[in-house]
């Protein structure tokens, strides 16, 4: 057992048929020694007597909030949450696996630049009863320190007869350098509790890995005198670093017919313009990624080739 | 050239050959062996690898003041990476795949290390450590690992000679 | 299996230019380096360029600098080497093959014929 | 560029018996060379990388040896399938060079 906040306990418990439990002691936070009583959640049955209960843990019935009273005025509570370990495994009940980009994904996290700056996002198909509470630091032997805000209710989507919750949080690093190489990972840990079930997540990466640049800002196309021909241009997104003379960016574009079958001409390049040839109905798109590191594309940037 | 008295060094070519090495770093990673092996073990297996630190003086304010220290700092990098390709972690069993790039990245690395430092001048290298494993998984699982680092040791090499190219050339 | 088949014969006429492909199946296109070599009847094999799917970067032996662009369309695994302002110095067999250290696979070749 | 000078520019031998193909290199190239066979109207095909490295399938009569500059190709025990054209190649820095080839033919 262990204290995950005030007054609040998680038991960790081994999940099986049979299995015999834990033993909990919990003690009446009061100067009083005599006429203490026990009672657990909303019911009035006396569990025991004395400033210290003693009860054994074997499942969800036996978690909730125990209370000591004394002549009818509460003296303390203590919570307690059950940690359901199965076959050696933790349970993973509460949230969703993701699945991308690898099984047993439950959080995801992207950066737009290389500021600190980092948003981490997990779904779960609970829409009550639920809590959240996110740590972060750089490191783990030493960590140095990350300041995330509070988990909130990002999006609600309907998949098939489910409703699907998202929940995200941002993160920013304390001393973020990011000109620098990063040597340890930044660390994520989540506690979710969903009524007296606990659970932990967490998630391990560099911010270079989760960089994904705003796709291109003002795309635009400059039809070329007696040519099929168009200049494109765009700019960068104002979210990324700067100077862009050291965090650049290389651009994908792309011309695309109106059938996903017709060949997608694509042109690579360094620059903020690029000259192709629109097709009728066709459209073109511009997308970013870091210039030296391969982390994630943006998401594409369009306009109509007409 | 970036020469140990302090002139500068070929900020273009330094930036095309590095620009050439993130690429190389890239296209060598998945060709290293025949083992599908992920990230795995602890993080400690390359940490004693040289990583371009917060107070090397490689972010652009840096660069400005003196780019001499970061400099120095790249050049220990390339010849630390180089002389781990060359070493028995890469030559060793299991053999690289054919299609491998490895032999490209080594000859970049040098390449790269002797634009930073022409013969006859000397900066300081850092020790190389003695990472030899014995089994051939651990030198296929070392191999990710150095070349992921590798990768992200280039891409801030790579920004600071495009960052010297634009604002520092004479 | 891994497999390159490259585009038929091509019967051209000087200064002309030609595009020649290389079909890529069996294996993860973007991952690999694609390799292009030029063959004159009864010689030596000669490096013209590579190209890395994933980001388009390419490279050129000085030497065709300007004769051969190297190009992929990663939507259908292809790799493409355009010859430009041909001669009959041109006229030889091509081919790719995949990787940027040993070539392990190959193309059938391609043979370019520059003739009036 | 690397030179790569390949020798004999031409070899004749019966079958069984042992042939050995050497290349040297301009620089040193570490063990950065592939070997390949190529007949008549065909692609080539590789034998050997890495300078050691049997490729998939490749008989084990063949072998390659040598590190730097100086490498060769052993061929024992000689088959009449084992006749054509041998070359090396180097795939140290861009560009890579070839050597210009070894005609081995039957006796």
């Known amino acids: 057992i262990w204290e995950l906040k005030k007054d609040v306990y998680v038991v960790e418990l081994d999940w099986y048929p049979d299995a015999p439990g834990e033993m909990v002691v919990l003690t009446c936070d009061t100067p009083e020694e005599d006429g203490i009583t026990w009672t657990l959640d909303q019911s009035s049955e006396v569990l025991g007597s004395g400033k210290t209960l003693t009860i054994q843990v074997k499942e969800f019935g036996d978690a909730g909030q125990y209370t000591c009273h004394k002549g009818g005025e509460v003296l303390s509570h203590s919570l307690l949450l059950l940690h359901k370990k199965e076959d050696g495994i933790w349970s993973t009940d509460i949230l969703k696996d993701q699945k991308e980009p690898k099984n047993k994904t439950f959080l995801r996290c992207e950066a737009k630049n290389y500021s600190g700056r980092f948003t981490c996002w997990w779904l779960t198909t609970i829409s009550t009863d639920l809590t959240f509470s996110v740590k972060s630091s750089r490191g783990s032997s030493d960590p140095q320190g990350v300041t995330c805000g509070a988990a909130t209710l990002s999006a609600e989507r309907v998949r098939g007869d489910n409703k699907e919750y998202e929940y995200s949080v941002e993160c920013q690093e304390d001393s973020a350098c990011p000109a620098a190489e990063e040597s340890l990972p930044i660390e994520v840990m989540v506690d979710a509790v969903h009524k007296l079930k606990y659970e932990n997540y967490t998630s391990s990466f560099f911010i270079r890995d989760i960089i994904k640049p705003d796709p291109p800002k003002n795309l635009q196309l400059k039809p070329l005198k007696n040519s099929r021909q168009v200049e494109v241009s765009w700019e960068y997104p104002d979210t990324w670093s700067t100077p862009h003379s050291y965090f650049s960016l290389t651009f994908c574009v792309q011309v695309q017919g109106k059938s996903k079958r017709e060949k997608k001409d694509r042109v690579f390049t360094d620059k903020t313009s690029a000259t192709v040839i629109c097709r009728k109905n066709a459209s073109i798109s511009v997308r970013a990624q870091d210039r030296y590191y391969s982390s994630s594309w943006s998401e594409w940037a369009s306009v109509p080739c007409s | 050239r970036a020469v140990p008295g302090g002139s500068s060094p070929a900020w273009t070519q330094c930036q095309q050959l590095s620009q050439k090495l993130c690429t190389l770093a890239w296209s060598a990673h998945p060709l290293v062996g025949h083992m599908d092996l992920r990230e795995e073990g602890d993080e400690e297996t390359t940490n004693d690898v040289p990583h371009i630190q917060c107070g090397d003086g490689c972010d652009p304010q840096g660069l400005r003041d003196n780019s001499q220290f970061c400099l120095q700092r790249i050049h220990q990098g390339l010849i630390f990476y180089e002389k781990l390709l060359g070493s028995d972690i890469f030559t060793g069993e299991p053999s690289l795949l054919p299609d491998s790039p490895v032999g490209q990245l080594h000859a970049s690395l040098l390449g790269l290390s002797q634009l930073l430092q022409p013969e006859g001048h000397h900066w300081e290298t850092q020790q190389i450590p003695s990472l030899s494993p014995s089994q051939p998984w651990q030198r296929l699982l070392l191999r990710f690992k150095i070349l992921r680092s590798l990768q992200a040791f280039v891409a801030v090499a790579a920004r600071v000679f495009a960052h010297g190219a634009a604002t520092l050339s004479p | 299996h891994v497999q390159l088949q490259q585009s038929g014969p091509e019967l051209v006429r000087p200064g002309a230019s030609v595009e020649l492909s290389c079909k890529a199946s069996?294996?993860?296109?973007?991952?690999?380096?694609m390799t292009w070599m030029k063959q004159r009847p009864g010689q030596g094999l000669e490096w013209i360029g590579q190209?890395?799917?994933?980001?388009?970067?390419?490279d050129y032996n000085e030497m065709f600098e300007g004769k051969a662009t190297l190009t992929v369309d990663t939507s259908s695994n292809t790799a493409y080497m355009q010859l430009s302002s041909l001669t009959s110095e041109d006229s030889a067999v091509y081919f790719c093959?995949?990787?940027?250290?040993?070539?392990?696979?190959w193309g059938q070749g391609t043979l370019v014929t520059v003739s009036a | 560029d690397i030179q790569m000078t390949q020798s004999p520019a031409s070899l004749s031998a019966s079958v069984g018996e042992t042939v050995t193909i050497t290349c040297r290199t301009s620089?040193?190239?570490?063990?950065?060379l592939a070997w390949y066979q190529q007949k008549q109207g065909k692609s080539p095909q590789l034998l050997v990388y890495?300078?050691?490295t049997l490729a998939e399938g490749v008989p084990s009569r063949f072998s390659g040896s040598g590190s730097g500059t100086q490498f060769s190709l052993k061929i024992n025990r000689l088959q009449p399938e084992d006749f054509g054209r041998y070359f090396c190649?180097?795939?140290?820095?861009?560009?890579?060079?070839f050597g210009s080839g070894t005609k081995l033919e039957i006796k």
């Open positions: 093959a995949r990787g940027g250290g040993g070539f392990a696979y």
């Open positions: 890495n300078a050691k």
């Open positions: 069996g294996y993860i296109f973007i991952t690999y380096w």
């Open positions: 190649q180097h795939h140290y820095g861009i560009p890579f060079t």
């Open positions: 190209i890395f799917p994933a980001s388009g970067s390419a």
């Open positions: 620089e040193n190239i570490y063990s950065y």
